[in-house]
Interface confidence: low
């Protein structure tokens, strides 16, 4: 069950004429007849199988149609149907001229038709309006349409009946597809099953209405997750109903017998440790200096002769104290001290006894330190070398290794970089803050004028017979070093032939 809705929006008949071409007098008082039927490939006359509807006169010639759904429900036009929507349709919209007030078909002349449009197609159920516009030679009609389900009908074809309810038989509303949607607090196929209080134990609790948690026998608590122990259980708990599992220190059928005498009565004295050994039974483990069943009797701690190596014992309020003889120390005089007889001084240090030999002191030679002269003196720790010099320990003294350009005991003196004549081939040296610069004579270049820039005499390959060519930099000439069997300034003559016969 559903409704085909047609919303007429605008009709244009600018010349105010009928379909026959004849003008309306005084203007075309226009109303519409709508026919909705099953799908036809070619829309033909015949019964309007899905329904018909007519409008009153909506305007003259050209006009916009007001959305009047609130006041009387005339626009959109309603074409209800009581069957499963097939998804296809044919629609005929006729515009008629009403000369008088009687709009019945039989009361109108047949030529009162202004225009007729026929469309067909697919149309799914939904809230979306489909907009369309149909134009003929003289008129234009703009409209939109849709199919929606009637109340309580749902699904793609409006075939699914669903009526919301909230009673013993169900608590639900309907989804757009017609499926049930349970009201808050309800579940199950027909939403008849209440959802218990969140956390209510699945097995031990139940409910007859939402957010409730009723306990089954033997269980208690807000969420029915606490068991009820056996009646008369005194100092015990349960993990299942009617159980009595005794707390620590308690026994008996109802956990009413005291097994933890230590905790409940504290019988041990003077900080002793108490251990339970049965009902009303305990054992005290005494701290040193105490005895008795409850450690109530005090012992003298010196009775056990705790001091060694001839130390004498003195009783004190919180224990005892050992007075050690010379050469021994520690809580029980168990440690012996060193004396000069043990040669404790290293690196040639000399030993001096103190306090009648009870202890000693070492006098260290130069370069060594420490209570036993075991540490070598490092004279470089104060970083005495300036200008990035490296400090080196050399026996009893130290020395600085200076970076280039510095001298002096502590590298504190700046050396003239030009003092060692670094510029070659007569170059002029200039001292700069961070080094030097050479001004080179003609024919030389490079940082130290070491590169000869005049023409290389060997460049023209003057030597013959695979001789090796050398440039004489002082004279700017070449020298040929001849291979075996050749002579001449260019090695041009073979040995044994006169010079007048060059090879």
């Amino acid at each position: 069950s559903g409704v085909f809705q047609l919303q007429l929006q605008e009709f244009i008949n600018e010349r105010g004429v009928l379909a026959s071409g004849r003008p309306c007098e005084p203007g075309c008082r226009t109303f519409f007849r709508v026919c909705l039927k099953h799908f036809q490939a070619v829309v033909s006359p015949g019964p309007c199988t899905f329904g018909t509807v007519s409008t009153p006169v909506l305007g003259t010639n050209s006009f916009a149609v007001r959305d009047d759904s609130s006041g009387g429900g005339r626009n959109p036009l309603q074409l209800p149907f009581n069957f499963t929507w097939p998804g296809t349709f044919s629609l005929i919209i006729e515009a008629w001229h009403a000369p008088g007030d009687d709009l019945r078909p039989e009361a109108l002349p047949p030529d009162a038709l202004i225009s007729k449009i026929a469309i067909q197609g697919s149309l799914a159920v939904g809230q979306n309006w489909l907009l369309d516009e149909q134009t003929s030679t003289l008129t234009r009609l703009r409209y939109s349409y849709r199919v929606i389900c009637s109340d309580n009908y749902y699904g793609d074809n409006c075939s699914r009946l669903c009526k919301k309810r909230n009673d013993h038989f169900g608590h639900y509303v309907c989804q757009p597809d017609g499926n049930l949607s349970c009201l808050p607090g309800w579940t199950g196929e027909y939403c008849q099953q209440p959802i218990c209080l969140s956390g209510c134990h699945e097995q031990n609790g139940y409910c007859s209405k939402p957010a409730e948690c009723l306990c089954r026998p033997g269980w208690q608590g807000r969420l029915c997750n606490e068991c009820i122990p056996h009646n008369g259980c005194r100092h015990g708990t349960c993990s299942t109903p009617w159980q009595c599992t005794c707390d620590e220190g308690w026994g008996g059928l109802f956990c009413d017998q005291d097994l933890n005498y230590c905790t409940h009565h504290s019988p041990c004295k003077n900080g002793a440790t108490c251990s339970n050994s049965g009902q009303r039974s305990y054992t005290c483990t005494c701290r040193p200096g105490y005895t008795g069943v409850d450690c109530e009797l005090e012992l003298s701690e010196c009775d056990s002769n705790p001091c060694r190596n001839g130390g004498s014992c003195k009783d004190q309020e919180d224990g005892y104290h050992c007075l050690c003889p010379p050469g021994y120390y520690g809580l029980h005089c168990e440690h012996s001290t060193l004396s000069c007889a043990d040669s404790p001084c290293f690196n040639g240090g000399s030993c001096r006894e103190r306090n009648q030999g009870a202890n000693y002191a070492c006098e260290c030679p130069p370069n060594f330190t420490g209570s036993n002269c075991e540490k070598k003196v490092d004279r470089c720790t104060s970083n005495p070398c300036a200008n990035g010099g490296q400090c080196l320990n050399r026996g009893p003294s130290r020395m600085c290794r200076c970076r280039p350009g510095f001298t002096g005991t502590y590298c504190e003196l700046h050396v003239s970089d030009c003092a060692r004549n670094p510029c070659a081939h007569g170059g002029t040296c200039h001292d700069l803050e961070n080094g030097l610069m050479c001004t080179c004579p003609a024919g030389f270049s490079g940082r130290r004028c070491e590169v000869r820039t005049s023409i290389d005499a060997c460049a023209s390959s003057p030597c013959f017979n695979r001789a090796t060519c050398y440039t004489d930099l002082s004279t700017d000439t070449f020298v040929c070093n001849c291979p075996y069997g050749f002579v001449g300034s260019r090695c041009e003559f073979p040995v044994g032939l006169p010079p007048s016969f060059p090879w």
């Epitope: 919303q7 929006q9 959305d67 799914a124 939904g126 809230q127 979306n128 309006w129 489909l130 907009l131 369309d132 939109s144």
Partner: nanobody, 123 residues
Framework: EVQLVESGGGLVQSGGSLRLSCAAS????????MSWVRQAPGKGPEWVSA????????YYADSVKGRFTISRDNAKNTLYLQMNSLKPEDTAVYYC????????????????WGQGTQVTVSS
């Protein structure tokens, strides 16, 4: 007659924002679902976002989810698209349209389109 007029496009840098508007006239705007569609140079139309007639339900293409927000003001007959965190691939002509039907991912057919507004995102 139905008219849809888009505005608010322009040139913006990557990461920037724009707000598009679509002024509707010639039909009962509040009765219709509305949609934004875009067409990049040399490509077919791509559905961007849609909103139901009352404005309570909104839908977005995966490519714009979390960056674009569709809204409408039925009293002013205007549809909006707020575009944040724009990317160069958002460059296109943006159209507002009345959807004619829905496919699995969104509207796939449109009854009416506007003339469009150009959005260019530079990197």
């Amino acid at each position: 007659e139905v008219q849809l007029v888009e505005s608010g496009g322009g040139l913006v840098q990557s990461g920037g924002s724009l707000r598009l508007s679509c002024a509707a006239s010639g039909f009962t705007f509040g009765s219709y679902d509305m949609s934004w569609v875009r067409q990049a140079p040399g490509k077919g139309p791509e559905w961007v976002s849609a909103i139901n007639s009352g404005g309570g339900s909104t839908y977005y293409a995966d490519s714009v989810k979390g960056r674009f927000t569709i809204s409408r003001d039925n009293a002013k007959n205007t549809l909006y698209l707020q575009m944040n965190s724009l990317k160069p691939e958002d460059t296109a002509v943006y159209y507002c349209a009345i959807p004619r039907g829905w496919g699995p991912t969104g509207p796939h057919e449109y009854a009416y389109w506007g003339q469009g507004t150009q959005v260019t995102v530079s990197s």
